[in-house]
C-alpha cells in the first residue's frame, strides 16, 4: 500500500535529481560542441564574436569554489532561457543561410528546452524560491546581413558552449557537496 492519503510524497533524492540534470547538461554540451565544429567548418570566421544581447558569462576563474546551488540554478536557468531565445531567433532569421545546420539547430533547441524544464523541476523539488516570470525581452533585431547572422551564430554557440561548460563544472562540484 502507498502512503496514506494526504501525506506528502517522499521527495526524490536530491543527488539523483541533480545527477540527471548534470547528465542532460553534459549531453547538451556535446551537442553544442559538435554544432560549433560544424559551424566553424562550413562558415569559418576568425576571431572572437560578440552579441550584446547575450548574457555575460556567469563566472570568473576563482568563483567555482564559492558556488551555492540556488544561485547556480537560478543563474543557469536565466542564461539558458536567453540562449533558447537566441537560438529560436537564429533559426527564424537565418533559415535559408543556415539550412545545412538546420536539423542540428532544431535538435539543440529541443534539448535546451528539455534542460530548462529539468532545471525548473529541480528547483521546485529542492524548494528553491520560484522566480517571477521574466519581463518580455525586447525583440532581437534581424541581422544586418548574412555575414552578420553567421557571426551571430558563432557568438551564440560559443557563448552557449562556455555557459554549459561552466554549468557542468559547477553542478559536478555541488553534487559532491550534497
Amino acid at each position: 500500500p502507498g502512503p496514506p492519503p494526504g501525506s506528502p510524497r517522499a521527495s526524490p533524492d536530491p543527488r539523483a535529481e541533480l545527477d540527471s540534470t548534470v547528465l542532460l547538461t553534459r549531453s547538451l554540451l556535446e551537442d553544442t560542441r559538435q554544432l560549433t565544429i560544424q559551424l566553424k567548418d562550413k562558415f569559418p570566421a576568425d576571431g572572437d564574436h560578440n552579441l550584446d544581447s547575450l548574457p555575460t558569462l556567469a563566472m570568473s576563474a576563482g568563483a567555482l569554489g564559492a558556488l551555492q546551488l540556488p544561485s547556480v540554478l537560478t543563474r543557469l536557468r536565466a542564461d539558458l532561457l536567453s540562449y533558447l531565445r537566441h537560438v529560436q531567433w537564429l533559426r527564424r532569421a537565418m533559415g535559408s543561410s543556415l539550412k545545412t545546420l538546420e536539423p542540428e539547430l532544431g535538435t539543440l533547441q529541443t534539448r535546451l528546452d528539455r534542460l530548462l524544464r529539468r532545471l525548473q523541476l529541480l528547483m521546485s523539488r529542492l524548494a528553491l524560491p520560484q522566480l517571477p516570470p521574466d519581463p518580455p525581452a525586447p525583440p532581437l533585431a534581424p541581422p544586418s546581413s548574412t555575414w552578420g547572422g553567421i557571426r551571430a551564430a558563432h557568438a551564440i554557440l560559443g557563448g552557449l558552449h562556455l555557459t554549459l561548460d561552466w554549468a557542468v563544472r559547477g553542478l559536478l562540484l555541488l553534487k559532491t557537496r550534497l
Partner: antibody
Framework: EVQLVQSGAEVKKPGASVKISCKAS????????MDWVKQAPGQRLEWIGD????????IYNQKFTGRATLTVDKSASTAYMELSSLRSEDTAVYYC????????????WGQGTTVTVSS | DIVLTQSPASLALSPGERATLSCRAS??????????IHWYQQKPGQAPRLLIY???NLESGVPARFSGSGSGTDFTLTISSLEEEDFATYYC?????????FGQGTKLEIK
C-alpha cells in the same frame, strides 16, 4: 600535428613547490579543456583536475584541492600545473592531457614530466 | 568515488591469440545514451594512448583489432589477434562523475 609538450624533469625538496608547463600546438587551444593526471610508481593513474582555457575555471579532484593550482596563458597556448607543499608521495610522472567535459576522455597526452621529491 | 577494478592483473599470451581484458565499476557508469568508460594503452616510458572511448568507439588511428563492449558496471576490451606491439599495460577510465578515476591496469605480456 596535434601535440602537447611538457617542461623537463624537476627535483625538489619536501615543502617546496613545482610548476609544470604544457605547450599545446596543432589545434585551437581554447576549443578543448586541459586535464592533469598523476602517475606515481606502482600506482594507478590519478586525475588531478581540469581547466577551461577560455574562462580559466579549474575543477579539482578533492584529494588535490588546496595544493594543486591549474592556470593557463591563452596567448601562449600553454597550461600550467603548480603543486605546493611537496612531500615524498608526490614523486611521480605528471601528464597534461586534452579533454572536454561532455564525455571527459583524454585523446592527446603530453610526454610527461617527472617530479622527484627528496631531501 | 567510483572504483574501477581490472582483471586479470596480468595476462601472458602469444602473438595471434585473442586477449580479453575486463573492467568492473563499483557503480553503474552508464546512462541513457552513453557508457562513460574509456580504454588506454601505455608502454614503458611513454604516455597513455586513447584506444576506445565511450565503451565501444574506436579512436581514430587505432587498429580495428581493438574493440570495446559492455554497459552498466561490466566492460571488456578485446584484441582479436595480438600483434607484437600490443604487449603493454591497459587502463580503463570512467567519466561518469567527479572525479574521473582509472583502473589499476592489466599488464599484457608475451608468453
Amino acid at each position: 600535428e596535434v601535440q602537447l609538450v611538457q617542461s623537463g624533469a624537476e627535483v625538489k625538496k619536501p615543502g617546496a613547490s613545482v610548476k609544470i608547463s604544457c605547450k599545446a600546438s596543432g589545434y585551437t587551444f581554447t576549443d578543448y579543456n586541459m586535464d592533469w593526471v598523476k602517475q606515481a610508481p606502482g600506482q594507478r593513474l590519478e586525475w588531478i583536475g581540469d581547466i577551461n582555457p577560455t574562462i580559466g575555471a579549474p575543477i579539482y579532484n578533492q584529494k588535490f584541492t588546496g595544493r594543486a593550482t591549474l592556470t593557463v596563458d591563452k596567448s601562449a597556448s600553454t597550461a600550467y600545473m603548480e603543486l605546493s607543499s611537496l612531500r615524498s608521495e608526490d614523486t611521480a610522472v605528471y601528464y597534461c592531457a586534452r579533454g572536454e567535459l561532455a564525455h571527459w576522455y583524454f585523446d592527446v597526452w603530453g610526454q610527461g614530466t617527472t617530479v622527484t621529491v627528496s631531501s | 568515488d567510483i572504483v574501477l577494478t581490472q582483471s586479470p592483473a596480468s595476462l601472458a599470451l602469444s602473438p595471434g591469440e585473442r586477449a580479453t581484458l575486463s573492467c568492473r565499476a563499483s557503480k553503474s557508469v552508464s546512462t541513457e545514451g552513453y557508457s562513460y568508460i574509456h580504454w588506454y594503452q601505455q608502454k614503458p616510458g611513454q604516455a597513455p594512448r586513447l584506444l576506445i572511448y565511450l565503451a565501444s568507439n574506436l579512436e581514430s588511428g587505432v587498429p580495428a583489432r581493438f574493440s570495446g563492449s559492455g554497459s552498466g558496471t561490466d566492460f571488456t576490451l578485446t584484441i582479436s589477434s595480438l600483434e607484437e606491439e600490443d604487449f603493454a599495460t591497459y587502463y580503463c577510465q570512467h567519466s561518469r562523475d567527479l572525479p574521473p578515476t582509472f583502473g589499476q591496469g592489466t599488464k599484457l605480456e608475451i608468453k
